[in-house]
Interface confidence: low
């Protein structure tokens, strides 16, 4: 018929699925795309940058022993041939084809057509509602080994839900009759039959349903509560969550700082067993009796110290050794003259002699001193 068809031309290069079928030589850089529309029409398109301003011709045959026919149904792009539409009614055949520049073959190949099947979009889509379920049916395509996929969503859903069957009879359960749902349907070729290079059909038109009745559209955001209100609630919730998190973090930091600045004062009864029970709080007697390790000099004014309720605390605690830190002489002097001292919670080197308030202790490598 020699018709020049612009039907697919404009959209053809927007489609994916190009095959770089370079076979060396002149074929290099030629991109070919084959789509077998519904086992009815084969569309072969090419993109050969080297020949972008040339009317390439397409020659084909369906059997290896036939003579080549020339395409009579070309696709045009910017006034030049860019593809061919072939009538190939339900043929499970190999397409042998050659793209030529005059008599010179630019590209020659053979391909099983069904590997590039694109089924037609579902037709006669019908919805049958029963309480919280819907059965979506449509006319099965006239050939088999297909999957019929229904996607649906309500404005409450962030993405499409999907269900598929191998006939166009798909029941979706667990729907909320009060919600508005959008549906669309498409057909896909089974990969294990047709291979991985097929194309899904175009989607059917989106249909919206609520309470078993068709709607023009579903509101973009759910109606109850109002869209702006729901956004406000979401933002407010996030802000409150952030504030609470920051508050908890602040409290935790504050607790850490407090613990660092004002260490906990343990009960001396548990740290110095027998000091109060046997020696009635006489520390010198207790230390002599229990350890007998150091000579203690009684400070002047030590008699005025308060009783067992407020003893000088020397905390011996198990702690992991960090970088050992010695007390410098100035610090010792301050303490001796009654100045307040805050010692860091770092362990001191084992075996060091420490004098505090006139008492001298030998510290092991697992001990630290705290006031």
């Amino acid at each position: 018929m020699g018709r020049l068809v612009l039907l697919w031309g404009a959209a053809v290069f927007l489609l994916g699925g190009w095959m770089a079928l370079g076979q060396g030589g002149a074929a290099e850089g030629v991109q070919i795309q084959i789509i077998y529309f519904n086992l009815e029409t084969v569309q072969v398109t090419w993109n050969a940058s080297k020949y972008s301003r040339t009317n390439l011709t397409f020659h084909y045959r369906f059997n290896g022993d036939e003579a080549y026919d020339q395409c009579t149904n070309y696709l045009l792009q910017e006034g030049h041939t860019s593809g061919c539409l072939l009538d190939a009614e339900q043929r499970d055949d190999i397409l042998y084809f050659s793209i030529r520049n005059g008599t010179h073959p630019v590209f020659t190949a053979s391909r099983w057509m069904v590997y590039y099947l694109k089924p037609s979009s579902p037709k006669h889509v019908r919805f049958s509602w029963h309480q919280d379920a819907v059965t979506v049916t449509c006319s099965d395509l006239s050939y088999g080994d297909l999957l019929y996929e229904v996607q649906y969503r309500s404005p409450f859903d962030t993405e499409w839900q999907s269900k598929q069957e191998n006939t166009c009879n798909v029941t979706i359960e667990g729907l909320d009759a009060e919600k508005c749902y959008s549906f669309w349907v498409r057909v896909k070729a089974m990969e294990d039959v047709y291979g991985p290079d097929t194309y899904p059909s175009d989607w059917s038109e989106v249909t919206c349903w609520q309470r078993g009745e068709i709607r023009d559209a579903c509101a973009e955001t759910p109606t109850p509560p109002k869209p702006k209100l729901s956004k406000f609630i979401l933002i407010s919730s996030l802000a409150i969550l952030l504030m609470v998190s920051l508050l908890l973090l602040s409290l935790w930091k504050l607790w850490r700082v407090k613990k660092f600045l004002i260490p906990s004062v343990p009960d001396p009864k548990s740290i110095f067993p027998g000091l109060f029970e046997i020696h009635q709080g006489n520390f010198q007697e207790w230390i002599t009796d229990t350890q007998n390790v150091a000579h203690l000099h009684k400070m002047a004014g030590a008699e005025q110290e308060s009783g067992p309720e407020e003893p000088l605390v020397v905390q011996l605690a198990k702690t992991e050794a960090e970088s050992p830190r010695m007390l410098d002489p100035q610090t010792e002097e301050k303490e001796a003259s009654g100045g307040s001292l805050q010692l860091p919670h770092q362990p001191l080197q084992g075996g060091d002699v420490v004098t505090i308030g006139g008492f001298t202790f030998v510290m092991n490598d697992r001990s630290y001193v705290a006031l």
Partner: antibody, heavy 120, light 107 residues
């Protein structure tokens, strides 16, 4: 060349059933719908239903529901049986192949027709 | 079901005339409309599919147009073999329906 060849004319009594066959040749693929359309004398065309030769599934026109059955014995031979015949079922019955083209479909090949006469 | 109304139901014309037949659907059927020609004692034959696509082998004097609910079949210059009955058919709905037919006879 695609051909749909139907069985010969039938004369039936009211209340009886008729079974018309349609044998397809000239194409190998089972993936087609076969439709049945009838035409009463001097009247227009009336669609009765479709039958998927591949899947063996039928859709019937509401008017014929419960009275018509479409079947096949192989992928190339389809049957239409109409039961409880009445005199107004007198018509030429056609089997028709549906071609699906992209998102459209149409009847590209028709059988020669089978005249069914219902008369007491 | 979608109702298809064809008009006129019959018309008389002469060879060389331009003939227009219209078909109206009771609801929108997009472009899912086909036209068939039927001669006495014969099965119908496809002329136009998808509202305006000419079936292979059909003379170019036949053309179709329209979408939605209103469609037209035009024969630009009537030939003697064109005297026949013309049927429109919608394939949009799962239940296929035909128009009542338009008989074109010799004036």
């Amino acid at each position: 060349q695609v051909q749909l060849v139907q069985s010969g004319a039938e004369v039936k009594k009211p209340g009886a059933s008729v079974k018309v066959s349609c044998k397809a040749s000239g194409y190998t693929f089972s993936g087609y719908y076969m439709h049945w359309v009838r035409q009463a004398p001097g009247q227009g065309l009336e669609w009765m239903g479709r039958f998927n030769l591949h899947g063996g599934v039928a859709d019937y026109a509401q008017k014929f529901q419960g009275r018509v059955t479409m079947t096949r014995t192989s992928i190339s031979t389809a049957y239409m049986e109409l039961s409880r015949l009445r005199s107004d079922d007198t018509a030429v019955y056609y089997c028709v192949r549906e071609r699906q083209w992209l998102v459209q479909d149409y009847f590209d090949y028709w059988g020669q027709g089978t005249l069914v006469t219902v008369s007491s | 079901d979608i109702q298809m109304t064809q008009s006129p139901s019959s018309l008389s014309a002469s060879v060389g005339d331009r003939v227009t037949i219209t078909c109206r659907a009771s609801q929108s059927i997009s472009r899912s409309l086909n036209w068939y020609q039927q001669k006495p004692g014969k099965a119908p034959q496809l002329l136009i599919y998808a509202a305006s696509s000419l079936q292979s082998g059909v003379p170019s004097r036949f053309s179709g147009s329209g979408s939605g609910t209103d469609f037209t079949l035009t024969i630009s210059s009537l030939e003697p073999e064109d005297f026949a009955t013309y049927h429109c058919q919608q394939s949009y709905s799962i239940s296929v329906t035909f128009g009542g037919g338009t008989k074109v006879d010799i004036k």
